[in-house]
Each structure stands twice: as C-alpha cells, then as structure tokens.
C-alpha cells in the first residue's frame, strides 16, 4: 500500500485554514469535489462538496467550510474559517467521478488548532472583533446525506496550505453572521 503523506499546519482558534488541492485539469475540471475528514482507523467522511458538475470559481459554503474550484488552474481551494480546537484532525481533498471511485488528492492535511490569541500577520484575528475574508456571495452544495455512497481510492496530485489571505473581505463581529448552517427539515 502507498504510504500516505501529511502536511502539518498549526493554527490558532479564530484563524482560517486555506488549502489548495491540485488536480489534472482536463480530467477532473468539472468533476464534483469534496473535503473529507479522516476519522480514526482510516475512515474518511465527507464534510462538504462542490456542486455537480463543479462550477468554475463558484464559492460554495457549508457551515464554516468554503470550497472554490478553479478549473483554469486545476485546483480546489478549501477554506475553514473561524477555526476551533475541535477542528483539529486529518483532512483530505477527493474528486468524485461516478461511476468510478473517488480519487484522493495528496497530501493530506494534519490540522492542529490551539487556543490562544495570535497577533501574527494573516491571523485574521484581533482583540475586539474577528475579521474573516469571505466571498460575499456563496451557495451551499447539496452534499449527499442518504444516497448511494462510494469509497475512496488514491491519486497522485499534491495539496498546499497556508493561512488565508483571500481577495475580498467582510468584517464581522459575530461568527454566526458568516455561518450558513444547512437547512434542516
């Protein structure tokens, strides 16, 4: 079995994780893509996904997760805003290509979120209010809740991550202002 590699990112609560997952342009541009958490014992679980087919540069927000698929660059951008300690864990990008199995994009992201104020540039946090740089218009993709699932296989592209510095920003004093919680029955 291929040894799966990880990139470790240590961030503070309130910061934003910004991940770029590269993929082969021609092959996967319009394929649906997802952000998954790897639970104990190699049990991936989808947290958010793009639309099907995936739209170019169209932000999709699911809770505190924002996905943007840049077809022309062959990369899926994943942001997790207002990070919480509980967000710590192992994550991966996958590409969904029915009827084939999903493809996993390397590297996996080992996210470690710690408590405490960080005054470093790009931390998206100050003492009085949280400032999150978020696309002003986002939609929520309908990730499957109870439809036929598939399992994950591996594919070789790389992923990179850093602390978020997106182009457009909205100043928010309340985290809930930016959380588009899924609509429940």
């Amino acid at each position: 079995a291929t040894k799966l590699t990880e990139e470790k990112y240590e961030l503070k609560e309130g910061q934003t994780l910004d991940v770029k997952c590269d993929y082969t342009l021609e092959k996967f541009a319009s394929s649906q893509k997802a952000w998954q958490i790897i639970r104990d014992g190699e049990m991936p679980k989808t947290l958010a996904c793009t639309e099907r087919p995936s739209k170019n540069s169209h932000p999709v927000q699911v809770g505190r997760i924002i996905l943007e698929d840049y077809h022309d660059h062959g990369l899926l951008r994943v942001r997790m805003v207002n990070l919480q300690v509980e967000d710590s864990g192992l994550y991966q990008c996958v590409i969904y290509q029915p009827p084939k199995e999903p493809h996993m994009l390397f590297d996996r992201i080992r996210l470690v979120v710690t408590k405490g104020f960080s005054g470093t540039p790009g931390s998206n946090e100050n003492s009085t209010q949280n400032v999150y740089k978020i696309p002003p218009t986002t939609t929520k993709a309908l990730c499957p809740l109870y439809t036929s699932p598939r399992t994950v296989t591996q594919a070789p592209p790389k992923s990179t991550a850093d602390v978020s510095t997106p182009d457009s920003e909205i100043n928010l004093t309340n985290v809930t202002d930016i959380i588009r919680v899924p609509v429940f029955n």
Epitope: A34, Q36, R39, D40, G41, E42, M43, P44, K45, T46, L47, A48, V62, G63, R64, I65, M80, Q84, E86, D87, Y96, P102, C143, P144, L145, Y146, T147, S148, P149, R150, T151, V152, I179, R180, V181, P182, F184, N185
Partner: antibody, heavy 122, light 112 residues
C-alpha cells in the same frame, strides 16, 4: 432488500472467545462502514468499534482494545467480531449496524442486524 | 469521551398527546460543516434499534412526520407531536462527533 443477518446465540465459558458474524445483502458491501454495538441485559447501547469493509481498516473503543478483533470477508459480504478473554460482564446482545460510507455526510446507523445473544457463564 | 445525558429516564405518555425527550452532550456536536452529529434511535420491545433522526434534525426514511429533532451544539430535543401506541420503547440519542461513538442512557416511553 437491504439487510444484515447475524449468526445465532452463543454460550461461552469465562476466558473463552466468541466470533459473531454479520452477513450483508441488498447493497454494495464495500461502500458502507460497519459498526458493532452491544447491549447488556436491561442496559443501554455501547459502541464497540468500526470496520471499513473496503480496506479492512478498523477502529475500536478503548474499552475493548486488545480484546476485540473485527474482520471482513468481501467474497461473502460478511463482517466478523471476535471478542476474547470473555467475562460475565460481556453477556449481552451484540449488534452489527451499517453506517453510510465515506462519500456521505451522515454517520447514522440506518440498518441494524437482528442481534446475537452471547452468554458468558461458568 | 463525549458523555451523553438523556432526560427523563422514564416518560409515561397519553396517546394523542405530545412528548419530548432531552439529550445533552458534554462537548459540542456541531461540526465545521454546520451539521450536528447527533442521531436518535428507537428500540421497540424485543427489537433492534431503528434510526429516527440523523444529523440532529433530519428524519430517516419511513419515519412518520410526528417525530422531529431539534437543537444544536450540546442541547438536543426529540419531539413526538402526537404519541401513538406503537411509539412505545426506549429512545436513545447517539453522538458521532468524536470517537468513541457514545449513546445516552435511554428514555423509556410507555403508555399511561
């Protein structure tokens, strides 16, 4: 239709091992994670662990670590749960329960086996 | 481990009347994707448990609409708008936010 059929009741002596099977049908076996949950007489539900039938990877509750082994046979669409060093407190009904696989957001157990009663007595 | 606390322990109900069960978790079950990883199950006498509600408030297939789930974070509620005789049994909440999955102690619903 989709169902999980478990093996029959077992009576074991303390210190022995028991192996319970759970045969899946009506769906793609490797696309759904399988959990094991037990219930002591008159008690609540207790999660034991999970197996990914696709690759065979497992994760066990700390309480059962070292005593439980979950395996699968893809050719027969069957998962197994073996519990060793049995003691009287292990007397319970053991259930296998299906969880949606990696692509689905939900983690709920939508299909349950009928349960297997395991009695540990000297 | 995340501890799940259910109340009441026992709930005597009158058919046609509403019923409510509470479930509290020791840690937030709200994930980064906005979903609460909390499910509700009903175990009827002599049967295996059956799924009622998943992800906090989504009714499982075939579950009557008199059942509803609500709540977020650490406080959740299962409501039955009009109890029917067939609803008797033990109700369990379960968290899937963190390993190990843990269940509440159960609430026994019985007809008065």
């Amino acid at each position: 239709q989709v169902q999980l059929v478990q093996s029959g009741a077992e009576v074991k002596k303390p210190g022995a091992s028991v192996k319970v099977s759970c045969k899946a049908s009506g769906y793609t076996f490797t696309s759904y994670y399988m959990h094991w949950v037990r219930q002591a007489p008159g008690q609540g539900l207790e999660w034991m662990g999970i197996i990914n039938p696709s690759g065979g990877s497992t994760s066990y509750a700390q309480k059962f670590q070292g005593r439980v082994t979950m395996t699968r046979d893809t050719s027969t669409s069957t998962v197994y749960m073996e519990l060793s060093s049995l003691r009287s407190e292990d007397t319970a009904v053991y259930y296998c329960a299906r969880e949606a696989g990696s692509w689905l957001i939900s983690t709920a157990f939508d299909i349950w086996g009928q349960g297997t009663m395991v009695t540990v007595s000297s | 481990d995340i501890v799940m606390t259910q109340s009441p322990l026992s709930l005597p109900v009158t058919p046609g009347e509403p019923a409510s069960i509470s479930c509290r978790s020791s840690q937030s079950l709200l994930h980064s994707n906005g979903y609460n990883y909390l499910d509700w199950y009903l175990q009827k006498p002599g049967q295996s448990p059956q799924l009622l509600i998943y992800l906090g408030s989504n009714r499982a297939s075939g579950v009557p609409d008199r059942f509803s789930g609500s709540g977020s974070g650490t406080d959740f509620t299962l409501k039955i708008s009009r109890v029917e005789a067939e609803d008797v049994g033990v109700y369990y909440c379960m968290q899937a936010r963190g390993t190990p999955w843990t269940f509440g102690g159960g609430t026994k619903v019985e007809i008065k």
